[in-house]
């Protein structure tokens, strides 16, 4: 899988889209996970509704939401009130039993808010990811009106 880069701005919302073959993945729930290391675990952040027919309903975990257009074949993840520590390598997954197929690898890059005059060091949370060739950058930036979301904390 090539990796698609999505750029967002700290404090705003970032929408990530993962297209897939709706027939091939018919009946399958989807998930969004965070790659904690180059060859380490991909930790589940949020998954679609337990009932596949209700996959269109938005589900939240902290400041991250997921919704699935099962007919159109597009999984959409929203990272609300984006923070520097939300940067990283993620995967959109299609679940079947205990297995998971990767639909898309996503690198989220978080830029400091140019309108935020606080010291950038106070916003900062850097990090890194895995080798991916020919990354495609998608600018998906929209202003968030929601404040104070708690970021999803990694756990082993």
């Amino acid at each position: 899988h090539n990796t698609t880069v999505f750029q967002g701005v700290a404090g705003q919302s970032l929408q990530v889209s993962c297209p897939y073959d709706s027939m091939k993945h018919w009946g399958r729930r989807k998930a969004w996970c965070r790659q904690l290391g180059e060859k380490g675990p991909c930790q589940r952040v949020v998954s679609t509704h337990n009932l596949w027919l209700l996959s269109f309903l938005r589900r939240w975990n902290g400041s991250t939401a997921i919704t699935d257009d099962t007919l159109g074949g597009t999984l959409t993840i929203t990272l609300r009130n984006l923070q520097p520590h939300d940067a990283g390598l993620y995967q959109c997954q299609s679940l079947h039993g205990s297995e998971a197929d990767t639909l898309r690898k996503v690198l989220v890059e978080v830029l400091a808010d140019p309108l935020d005059h606080r010291d950038a060091g106070d916003l900062w949370f850097p990090g890194e990811s895995e080798s991916f060739e020919d990354a495609h950058v998608e600018h998906s930036i929209s202003r968030s009106l929601l404040e104070g979301e708690i970021p999803f904390p990694p756990t082993s």
Partner: antibody, heavy 119, light 107 residues
């Protein structure tokens, strides 16, 4: 194989300037956040500066803010650190490092380049 | 800023010994901790991230545990190449701060 090779270190007088370079290979450089970490002689590790994979945002430790500038040239797979108004306390081995995005740990390190600030 | 304090500052061990060293955070950092190994004149090497995940190529004798403010790095059976200085680092939230290091020496 991931390789990071620093250059540009040396002896400089207080108040002087120096530019460090780091040539990266073995990975897709433009898709990685990068950072500089330093280590004063006989001391521990100190994070100095970082920037995002596109170079769109840069960040600095309080101790170097306003004096150091981090940058990158993704077409040349090279990371830079421009150091101005150098002080004796900036004397250290400077390591070029690759970061794991959003986690802030450093998974690969260069061999380091020594910067000595002395009159 | 959160401070990371390592103890002991040095410890002596023989090949084959089981050794543990600790890292204490001044505030709760969850499991957001990394460990590095550094040998004299060399660059640090990543050992563990998020407390217990071994980095590529790190032998299974290295393990990490803890959460909140107290963390432990354990080497189950020390090998000759393990004599080095070990640093912990707070990760996931800025600023990036390291402990002062624990030097593992040959007894």
């Amino acid at each position: 194989e991931v390789q990071l090779l620093e250059s540009g270190g040396g002896l400089v007088q207080p108040g002087g300037s120096l530019r460090l370079s780091c040539a990266a290979s073995g990975f897709t450089f433009s898709n990685y956040y990068m950072a500089w970490v330093r280590q004063a002689p006989g001391k521990g590790l100190e994070w100095v500066s970082s920037l995002t994979n596109s170079g769109g945002s840069t960040y600095y430790a309080d101790s170097v803010k306003g004096r150091f500038t981090i940058s990158r040239d993704n077409s040349k797979n090279t990371l830079y650190l421009q150091m101005n108004s150098l002080r004796a306390e900036d004397t250290a081995v400077y390591y070029c490092t690759r970061e794991w995005a959003g986690s802030g740990y450093f998974d690969y390190w260069g061999q380091g380049t020594l910067v000595t600030v002395s009159s | 800023d959160i401070q990371m304090t390592q103890s002991p500052s040095s410890l002596s061990a023989s090949v084959g010994d089981r050794v543990t060293m600790t890292c204490k955070a001044s505030q709760n950092v969850g499991n957001n901790l990394a460990w590095y190994q550094q040998k004299p004149g060399k660059a640090p090497k990543l050992l563990l991230y998020y407390t217990s995940n071994r980095f590529t190529g790190v032998p299974s004798r290295f393990s990490g545990s803890g959460s909140g403010t107290d963390f432990t790095l354990t080497i189950s059976s020390v090998q000759p190449e393990d004599f080095a200085t070990y640093y912990c680092q707070r990760i996931y939230n800025s600023p990036w701060t390291f402990g002062q290091g624990t030097k593992l020496e040959l007894k």
